[in-house]
């Protein structure tokens, strides 16, 4: 039975040209996290394997930085970066947990961070 929950940074906004940290945290389970995948819609941005470390897609390596921790930093943001991002936790023996973050990239300088929320 999967008992874990993923807490994410929720709905967030950031300024065009700036950077943002996407962060997820898996709790309420003793399952071993073997890998975390970061995806944007249908594209795989990066993976972080518990033993082999980070592997960033060459398509994104200029604008994606690993960390902090299991999070992902997006740099040089454009309005095209607006959309859904997913952290996918591969665990043993539980299986897969998925968290969702919605990022809005704003033209103005009034970007504010949204609230945190949980996905069971």
């Amino acid at each position: 039975m999967m008992t874990g929950t993923i807490e994410t940074t929720g709905n967030i906004s950031a300024e065009k040209g700036g950077s943002i940290i996407l962060q997820c945290h898996l709790s309420s389970t003793t399952a071993q996290v073997t890998q975390v995948n970061w995806e944007q819609q249908d594209q795989l941005l990066a993976i972080c394997n518990a033993d082999l470390g980070w592997h960033i897609s060459p398509s994104f390596k200029d604008r994606v930085a690993p960390g902090p921790g299991l999070g992902l930093t997006l740099q040089s943001l454009t309005v095209n970066d607006t959309g859904e991002y997913f952290c996918i936790y591969h665990t043993y023996p539980d299986g897969t947990y998925t968290g969702r973050i919605f990022l809005e990239v704003l033209e103005s300088s009034v970007a504010e961070h949204g609230a945190r929320f949980q996905i069971p």
């Epitope: 995948n37 082999l52 470390g53």
Partner: antibody, heavy 114, light 107 residues
Framework: EVQLVESGGGLVQPGGSLKLSCAAS????????MSWVRQTPDKRLELVAT????????NLPDSVKGRFTISRDNAKNTLHLQMSSLKSEDTAMYYC???????WGQGTSVTVSS | DIVMTQSHKFMSTSVGDRVSITCKAS??????VAWYQQKPGQSPKLLIY???TRHTGVPDRFTGSRSLTDHTLTISSVQAEDLALYYC?????????FGGGTKLELK
């Protein structure tokens, strides 16, 4: 030039033990996660163990869990695979592999037979 | 575990031919796919990673592509030295798994 040189293979009886080693050179060994991948006589490849760069985390599939142990000595640039309770299905060529499988050693052969 | 199926164990070709080696994943693995070449008596060597990126020193006649769960390694003009075993691998989900291999041989 990246070099990975495996040793320690041989013929062993079922239930026996063997320790494989891999000497690494040409790169900063302590910065890379490492793996052991085996190739069975029918040429199938199977990842049998991974270890974090600092040795603090390891992962092994169910097929070898409890029988195999992966370890490393960063001071000596060496990777190890301790294999015990060996079975005939463990017969394979064992390769030491760097990081995300970008460099492989030449392999060391393990035969489990009575 | 994700199963990577290389349906052709053998493929016959001629020098100069264009050949495509296919691999089907049992579920979507996005672009987390690598391809390896293994010549007789040698260890596997990385050719392609992230589905389409060539490893250092790999000739540009080798290209990788993806269509949903179907992954393809294409050699645009086969050379004699390309006759070898080719494996796909997924690293989308642990445990990482390999295809059964495709042996490229001369007609």
């Amino acid at each position: 030039e990246v070099q990975l040189v495996e040793s320690g293979g041989g013929l062993v009886q079922p239930g026996g033990s063997l320790k494989l080693s891999c000497a690494a050179s040409g790169f900063t060994f302590s910065s890379y996660g490492m793996s052991w991948v085996r190739q069975t006589p029918d040429k199938r490849l199977e990842l049998v163990a991974t270890i974090k760069s600092d040795g603090g985390s390891t992962n092994l599939p169910d097929s070898v869990k409890g029988r195999f142990t992966i370890s490393r000595d960063n001071a000596k640039n060496t990777l190890h695979l301790q294999m015990s309770s060996l079975k005939s299905e463990d017969t394979a060529m064992y390769y030491c592999v760097r990081g995300y499988f970008d460099y492989w050693g030449q392999g060391t052969s393990v035969t489990v037979s009575s | 575990d994700i199963v990577m199926t290389q349906s052709h164990k053998f493929m016959s070709t001629s020098v100069g031919d264009r050949v495509s080696i296919t691999c089907k994943a049992s579920q979507d693995v996005k672009t987390a796919v690598a391809w390896y070449q293994q010549k007789p008596g040698q260890s596997p060597k990385l050719l392609i990673y992230w589905s389409s990126t060539r490893h250092t020193g790999v000739p540009d006649r080798f290209t990788g592509s993806r269509s949903l769960t179907d992954h393809t390694l294409t050699i645009s003009s086969v050379q004699a030295e390309d006759l070898a075993l080719y494996y796909c691998q997924q690293y989308y989900s642990t445990p990482y798994t390999f295809g059964g291999g495709t042996k490229l041989e001369l007609k």
